[in-house]
Amino acid sequence: HSFGPGPGLGTPRSPCNARGPCRLFFRVCLKPGVSQEATESLCALGAALSTSVPVYTEHPGESAAALPLPDGLVRVPFRDAWPGTFSLVIETWREQLGEHAGGPAWNLLARVVGRRRLAAGGPWARDVQRTGTWELHFSYRARCEPPAVGAACARLCRSRSAPSRCGPGLRPCTPFPDECEAPSVCRPGCSPEHGYCEEPDECRCLEGWTGPLCTVPVSTSSCLNSRVPGPASTGCLLPGPGPCDGNPCANGGSCSETSGSFECACPRGFYGLRCEVSGVTCADGPCFNGGLCVGGEDPDSAYVCHCPPGFQGSNCEKRVDRCSLQPCQNGGLCLDLGHALRCRCRAGFAGPRCEHDLDDCAGRACANGGTCVEGGGSRRCSCALGFGGRDCRERADPCASRPCAHGGRCYAHFSGLVCACAPGYMGVRCEFAVRPDGADAVPAAPRGLRQADPQRFLAGVIAVIVVVVIAIVAGIVVLVISRKKRMAKYEKAEIKEMGEMHRELNA
């Protein structure tokens, strides 16, 4: 494990301040999985403080990443069955040493909290937690103390007699009906927290505790590692046998001494303090979050978990932040719903991952016979007469631009518009002024301008009127034909669009 400044956080910070040497401690606290992580509830499942802490003295220019840490293992004894789900709280404390008022000063450097799932007897689970500028790398596992076994450290009954001979008030043991369930009466005074018994009048200690009544923590025992604690009145006995004498590790496990105790390296398929727990099989359901267990048909074969989307870890116990992979394209907002991933797309984009750009002509076509024009990374619709809006879906008001001159009144028409001219004006847009004698019509000219040749001018005006009439007739013919074509195209586009919408809704 390691504790130090996180990456990319500039110059490594020293955990000690300028007041001299310091030591780091880890406090590990286990709470039931149902408790609120943020609340200061009791460490109901257990708590422990790291021991064998080296002193860290700050030297100028020394990297904080190389700071010495407590003994690599922090053991937290827990009572009753292992719940599988728990809240893990790890606090990193600094003890400032040296001469200053009030003795040693304690400061909480960092506190990481997380809800975890872990089956007892499984492999080490690795984790990295960041808080502020600090980063903590650690591993954790749960192991059962005998006689508890299994993923939940259930205390199994000891074989006493056949169910037919179970005494009054006693019932057959589950899951072993050929045994009897009988409450053991431990030695009077045996610690209920740190001791247990399998036979009447005995007191066996959980790991980390010693003494006849299991009330003495191993770390605070006055005996040296090489001595065995005796009764309270006798102090220490002479050196007894070593922890590995007689090899306490079952099933071929190899024993190694660790700070006055022992640790068993178990062969594959066995777990527990003394390798007494046979391996987990797929039938035990070791894979969390619905993970698929493969292999592990018998205790000697290892299992592998195939995790559902959004989970990882050897037992699928860790949730992946799938949004950190930025699956939503084009600036879409990622939402990890746990059982699914959703992208909320920005305007102009669509699709499960916002991969479809609605702002290009490959997207939806312009409606009502409009044509799509691309340019500058965006698209716009050039709409047919009488239509407007982004996709030419809105009916345009041709009179909105006040096209009729000289106070003419505008009327919208299926093919465009018609101007009803004010008295004294004529023309498609009322642009011609009519002479008072009715002889001819002239374009409304600015005051002060005069026509030099009335005859030639009149001939020109008549020619213009004839051209305009011919143009209007030809225009109407063209419009009627194109409208028929446009309506057919529009119906096709509508059918295609309905199909697309249906497909999108189903997806």
Epitope: T85, A119, A283, G285, G290, L292, P309, A507
Partner: antibody, heavy 117, light 107 residues
Framework: EVQLVESGGGLVKPGGSLRLSCVAS????????MNWVRQAPGKGLEWVGQ??????????HYAESVKGRFTISREDSKNTVYLQMNSLKTEDTAVYYC????????WGQGTTVTVSS | NIQMTQSPSSLSASVGDRVTITCKAS??????VSWYQQKPGKSPKLLIY???NRYTGVPSRFSGSGSGTDFTLTISSLQPEDFATYYC?????????FGGGTKVEIK
């Protein structure tokens, strides 16, 4: 050996109710997500719903076609998962299977539900 | 929901033949695809998970491949006990959905 055994199927009228059970053996039942999957006569497989673990507050998820009508529950002490089916429709006629996990690794033999007037 | 389209819906083959069944997803499902075998009157059995991994106890003649939207189940040498209906299923997005099935019959 892992075994899942469904029961409770039968003939029921439209609008009626039925409760299916699935008893598991050979597995640590409380550690497994449980699902119901159905298969209409001559048709393919359709996921119906799922119930997760005690540590997940027994969270349930359902297919849109059964939401509000079907309810899944479990009794870990009895190694049993249930499917309560209300307001049954003719289209609910199918063989109902219980399965484990996210990937449907273990399956029961199925129980037949017929909804007909 | 993601649609899984299986083809063919049925096929006839002889013992020893190489059989290929395809499955197409309506959108990218990564490699979160499983294949199941179902014999008449029996429950389905998991054959392949993660698109290409054989489940415990599945013979090596069964293999799966593909990623994204196109997936394949191959039986390298068809055996008499392999005549059944095969289903693909996607597990990328909730809810899980299945293909319509492919019935493998004796020619």
């Amino acid at each position: 050996e892992v075994q899942l055994v469904e029961s409770g199927g039968g003939l029921v009228k439209p609008g009626g109710s039925l409760r299916l059970s699935c008893v598991a053996s050979g597995i640590t039942f409380s550690n497994f997500w449980m699902n119901w999957v159905r298969q209409a006569p001559g048709k393919g497989l359709e996921w119906v719903g799922q119930i997760r673990l005690k540590s997940d507050d027994y969270a349930t998820h359902y297919a849109e076609s059964v939401k509000g009508r079907f309810t899944i529950s479990r009794e870990d002490s009895k190694n049993t998962v249930y499917l309560q089916m209300n307001s049954l429709k003719t289209e609910d006629t199918a063989v109902y299977y219980c399965t484990t996990g996210y990937y449907f690794d273990y399956w029961g033999q199925g129980t037949t539900v017929t909804v007909s007037s | 929901n993601i649609q899984m389209t299986q083809s063919p819906s049925s096929l006839s083959a002889s013992v020893g033949d190489r059989v290929t069944i395809t499955c197409k997803a309506s959108e990218n499902v990564g490699t979160y695809v499983s294949w199941y075998q179902q014999k008449p009157g029996k429950s389905p059995k998991l054959l392949i998970y993660g698109a290409s991994n054989r489940y415990t106890g599945v013979p090596s003649r069964f293999s799966g491949s593909g990623s994204g939207t196109d997936f394949t189940l191959t039986i390298s040498s068809l055996q008499p006990e392999d005549f059944a209906t095969y289903y693909c299923g996607q597990f990328y997005s909730f809810p899980s959905t299945f293909g319509g099935g492919t019935k493998v019959e004796i020619k």
